[in-house]
């Protein structure tokens, strides 16, 4: 038996940040589970992971490049990101494992949240602008 | 909830080497990282050595790159930590730490659980 995941297609982060929600038909409700999320096509690359105890608060973990806070729903976790760079433009997925209580559950895989990172374009106001028109 | 049970360590001359082992049991996810931090009397604990899951990734303290290779055995859920050319600076309490993080992290606050820690000294 496997847990289905639910993410959004798409997000575009135009300030840096985005928020990935990632929902679960599993109610994580006073379970111990751990939530993660990584980038890239085959998932190579784990960059943030939310630890859920039914004892102690969300342990929420990020790695280094990455600014990663998570919120935690009955069935869903939100990845919230910051300070995106450009490059890290690619396409994320949710994965969940629920360890307890038993039996041992994880996800089927989901189909990925493309990340969208803009950057930020800033116009330069011109110092001396001409004179204004009457 | 996770325990970890170390053994190795003792007393060794300047260059000599030893091999410490961490043997974790409990209930374990499918991704975790495992590493080696130290403390000297008076110093706060300080990261040595970290391994991920998959042992495609590893990372070290400056102070021991070359000398102390850390590995790790998944079918016995077990780090170690070979360490030689030891030099007196290295003498300190050795404490094994588990992450649920995936990756070789070497912040001491990603760590959840700690070994009982193993004395090493080293004799000038």
């Known amino acids: 038996n496997k847990i289905l995941v639910k993410q959004s297609p798409m997000l575009v982060a135009y300030d840096n940040a985005v928020n990935l929600s990632c929902k679960y038909s599993y109610n994580l409700f006073s379970r111990e589970f751990r939530a993660s999320l990584h980038k890239g096509l085959d998932s190579a690359v784990e960059v943030c992971v939310v630890y859920g105890n039914y004892s102690q608060q969300l342990q929420v973990y990020s790695k280094t490049g990455f600014n990663c806070d998570g919120k935690l729903g009955n069935e869903s976790v939100t990845f919230y990101l910051q300070n995106l760079y450009v490059n890290q433009t690619d396409i994320y997925f949710c994965k969940i494992e629920v360890m307890y209580p038993p039996p041992y559950l994880d996800n089927e895989k989901s189909n990925g949240t493309i990340i969208h990172v803009k950057g930020k374009h800033l116009c330069p106001s011109p110092l001396f602008p001409g004179p204004s028109k009457p | 909830e996770v325990q970890l049970v170390q053994s190795g360590g003792g007393l060794v001359q300047t260059g000599g080497s030893l091999r410490l082992s961490c043997a974790a049991s409990?209930?374990?996810?499918?991704?975790?990282?495992m590493g080696w931090f130290r403390q000297a009397p008076g110093k706060e604990r300080e990261f040595v050595a970290a391994?991920?899951?998959?042992?495609?990734?590893?990372d070290y303290a400056d102070s021991v790159k070359g000398r102390f290779t850390i590995s790790r055995d998944n079918a016995k859920n077990t780090v170690y930590l070979e360490m030689n050319s030891l030099k007196p600076e290295d003498t300190a309490i050795y404490y094994c730490?588990?992450?649920?993080?995936?990756?070789?992290?070497?912040?001491?606050?990603?760590?959840?659980?700690w070994g009982q820690g193993t004395q090493v000294t080293v004799k000038p």
């Open positions: 730490g588990f992450t649920y993080a995936g990756w070789a992290s070497s912040r001491r606050d990603d760590y959840n659980y």
């Open positions: 409990g209930r374990m996810f499918s991704n975790y990282a």
């Open positions: 391994i991920n899951y998959r042992r495609d990734s590893a």
